[in-house]
Amino acid sequence: LGCDLPQNHGLLSRNTLVLLHQMRRISPFLCLKDRRDFRFPQEMVKGSQLQKAHVMSVLHEMLQQIFSLFHTERSSAAWNMTLLDQLHTGLHQQLQHLETCLLQVVGEGESAGAISSPALTLRRYFQGIRVYLKEKKYSDCAWEVVRMEIMKSLFLSTNMQERLRSKDRDLGSS
């Protein structure tokens, strides 16, 4: 079945969600009017026919984009530095795991299209988030909306990873 995502990858993803939750600085109840439809490409994570290359590519691009988003001067000014450092470290570890897996999957001949297409879609999605933050002048509420949006999209992506893992288990036991 090719590269198995390291067993602790799912744990790292959950830790990232926990960290994002802990990073909350203001009550989201103050920010209702700042909600925005970022149009997360749900079709990318909802399919039942999950290819390993696709799943890994989506997760890799998601984590890369989250890392970039939270690795800026603006982000450093907005968040608790201790939690931000922990987030960076966790994301870096996950990215290393995924890069190893992606190289192996590509080496096994899975289509490059399965890898490049999600990346482009996700870059557009994250660009929309960056534009929103700039429009809102990087306000506390804008960052809070973005934090919750990232938690949602990461949660959906992690679910996709879990579905792939359980599919692999089913195939392995049959």
Epitope: L32, R35, R36, D37, E149
Partner: antibody, heavy 121, light 107 residues
Framework: EVQLVQSGAEVKKPGESLKISCKGS????????IGWVRQMPGKGLEWMGI????????AYSPSFQGQVTISADKSISTAYLQWSSLKASDTAMYYC??????????????WGQGTLVTVSS | DIQMTQSPSSLSASVGDRVTITCRAS??????LNWYQQKPGKAPKLLIY???SLQSGVPSRFSGSGSGTDFTLTISSLQPEDFATYYC?????????FGQGTKVEIK
């Protein structure tokens, strides 16, 4: 299948305390807020307050602040609405409903079946 | 608090009629407006969110429009099951507030 199941009807006397519940299933309970809405007999809908079950942060309508307490136990995916001293004017149907928080999604897309609270001496 | 005013408070119509209900906010709520349908003894049901987005599973005869302070719910061709009370609700800011309701009755 997403469901919000509320506790059964209650008949109470003025001055008594009460806690009604709303149990969520079929979705990630901590990813949505839970709101409470009152409907007095023959009247319209009134928003009472809301809770974020992930950390129990709450917001109340000024009309209900200090009159009721909203809480949640995320370990059992349940939100609560409670009164320490009921009044006859609390007689109403109470609904819970889920809210997507700051995420862009339909507001109050799923509702509980309602809990009828009757307060009478 | 943001006040929501619905009109009319009740209306009589026949099956097949086009029905329009309006909702006015006391200040701009941009597009943060929802419409609900409630039948006697039942919980409210979400029809339209974000002023014009049709909730999944809701028939396309229901539509919503408007932004800022003035909003409209339209039922293009009233069906027997549409006789109910309709509420608008703003979700622009806390406290969330509902309109007083519009009862749609059979003529």
């Amino acid at each position: 299948e997403v469901q919000l199941v509320q506790s059964g009807a209650e008949v109470k006397k003025p001055g008594e305390s009460l806690k009604i519940s709303c149990k969520g299933s079929g979705y990630s309970f901590t990813s949505y807020w839970i709101g409470w809405v009152r409907q007095m007999p023959g009247k319209g809908l009134e928003w009472m307050g809301i809770i974020d079950p992930s950390d129990s942060d709450t917001a109340y309508s000024p009309s209900f602040q200090g009159q009721v307490t909203i809480s949640a136990d995320k370990s059992i995916s349940t939100a609560y609405l409670q009164w320490s001293s009921l009044k006859a004017s609390d007689t109403a149907m109470y609904y819970c409903a889920r809210h997507p928080g700051l995420n862009w999604a339909p507001d109050f897309d799923y509702w509980g079946q309602g809990t009828l609270v009757t307060v009478s001496s | 608090d943001i006040q929501m005013t619905q009109s009319p408070s009740s209306l009589s119509a026949s099956v097949g009629d086009r029905v329009t209900i309006t909702c006015r906010a006391s200040q701009s709520i941009t597009g943060f407006l929802n419409w609900y349908q409630q039948k006697p003894g039942k919980a409210p049901k979400l029809l339209i969110y974000a002023a014009s987005s049709l909730q999944s599973g809701v028939p396309s005869r229901f539509s919503g429009s408007g932004s800022g302070t003035d909003f409209t719910l339209t039922i293009s061709s009233l069906q027997p099951e549409d006789f109910a009370t309709y509420y608008c609700q703003q979700s622009h800011d806390f406290p969330l507030t509902f309109g007083q309701g519009t009862k749609v009755e059979i003529k």
